[in-house]
Amino acid sequence: AQHVTTQLVLRNKGVYESVKYIQQENFWIGPSSIDLIHLGAKFSPCIRKDQQIEQLVLRERDLERDSGCCVQNDHSGCIQTQRKDCSETLATFVKWQDDTGPPMDKSDLGQKRTSGAVCHQDPRTCEEPASSGAHIWPDDITKWPICTEQAKSNRTGFLHMDCQIKGRPCCISTKGSCEITTREYCEFMHGYFHEEATLCSQVHCLDKVCGLLPFLNPEVPDQFYRLWLS
């Protein structure tokens, strides 16, 4: 059986939309599937790599690599999206291309970034971990770390940095899929909202879904002990 909840929820474009949340009900009137997984149920994607989930994550990453920051022209906010999902008339899509990106490092101004921009994250404004020396962030946003400390400046002069961010990574469903969503939408969908991250590639949703002890490598499920827990 399914339990359907419908509610008006604030979505990425800043408008309220009617959203359906479908929950698979437990036939025995007990915990939900997500709760059972958290409690240690035999759920194979938490024990070993699941090809289907792996391909979903790779597909999400490929899409994210090509994303940019969609900044609303009315200054109502910004969100990381694909160009096709960013209004050409109501918003500005900030994407580095044709030599408009910042240099990879101050030692070599000629080598420009082509991957980005990212809403609220920029190698020029992140102090920790700083993109410098032997630790230059790669020219692939899906390999960027989470910035834990921004430069102390209320205005950077960058469109994608000075806007109010409207969405962050949200881990939804037992498949460990990730979407950039508003907090409201994420909570309604019973997802896990990552306040600290800007990109889905910075979070490991399956690790969150499985719970218990974190994976040794967040990319590789290793909870073999589930076989004895349940």
């Epitope: 044709d98 030599d99 408009t100 990106g101 240099p103 101050k106 030692s107 070599d108 101004l109 000629g110 420009k112 020029r124 404004t125 102090e127 700083a130 410098s132 430069a151 102390k152 950077t156 002069g157 960058f158």
Partner: antibody
Framework: QVTLRESGPALVKPTQTLTLTCTFS??????????VGWIRQPPGKALEWLAH???????YYNPALKSRLTISKDTSKNQVVLTITNMDPVDTATYYC????????????WGQGTLVTVSS | EIVMTQSPDFQSVTPKEKVTITCRAS??????LHWYQQKPDASPKLLIK???QSISGVPSRFSGSGSGTDFTLTINSLEAEDAATYFC?????????FGQGTKLEIK
């Protein structure tokens, strides 16, 4: 409010070494993404970038003059010092210090400049 | 090094006129170009960054455009206080280089 002020001799003799000091306020050179550098302008001519020093002590010099230039900073005193060896009459110019940022590698604040004449 | 060439070297214009100053780079520099204004006996002042982005406190009559090798600084409805020399600067690669300047005289 950001201010920069250059100081140094108004007159130097050929072959001598010029030492210029930039004293600034309103920001710290330990602040991430900031640098201070020197640009000169011979009378009635274009601007020429000489050197920059960054918050992390990275230094960059104009290759055409690199062998003659040395830039250093004293963060506690809010000062940047530039020395130019083997001065020549063609080095006669107004020398400016300016703040630079890695945000766009442009100079957002400048000092008023100091005119240095090289003559025997 | 990248050579920046401005034109014209000198321009005499009347107030309220629209003025355009061009800057050409010896190689493509994307949008990594900035404009400065230098009034007589004063230090340069940043007007425009990244070819077209305005700087706070700079009058809106100043605007920039262009990418690649050709850039333009436009002053809409010139005012007497705009009498100055205008320089472009590239930050595409070291060493940072400037144009030779365009002197604007008000008739």
């Amino acid at each position: 409010q950001v201010t920069l002020r250059e100081s140094g001799p108004a007159l130097v003799k050929p072959t001598q070494t010029l030492t210029l000091t930039c004293t600034f306020s309103g920001f710290s050179l330990s602040t991430f993404a900031l640098g201070v550098g020197w640009i000169r302008q011979p009378p009635g001519k274009a601007l020429e970038w000489l050197a920059h020093i960054w918050w992390d002590d990275d230094k960059y010099y104009n290759p055409a003059l690199k062998s003659r230039l040395t830039i250093s900073k004293d963060t506690s005193k809010n000062q940047v010092v530039l020395t130019i060896t083997n001065m020549d009459p063609v080095d006669t110019a107004t020398y400016y210090c300016a703040r630079i940022t890695t945000y766009y590698y442009g100079m957002d604040y400048w000092g008023q400049g100091t005119l240095v004449t090289v003559s025997s | 090094e990248i050579v920046m060439t401005q034109s014209p070297d000198f321009q005499s214009v009347t107030p309220k006129e629209k003025v355009t100053i061009t800057c050409r780079a010896s190689q493509s520099i994307g949008n990594h170009l900035h404009w400065y204004q230098q009034k007589p006996d004063a230090s340069p002042k940043l007007l425009i960054k990244y070819a077209s982005q305005s700087i706070s406190g700079v009058p809106s009559r100043f605007s920039g455009s262009g990418s690649g090798t050709d850039f333009t600084l436009t002053i809409n409805s010139l005012e007497a206080e705009d009498a100055a020399t205008y320089f472009c600067q590239q930050s595409y690669q070291w060493p940072l280089t400037f144009g030779q300047g365009t002197k604007l005289e008000i008739k």
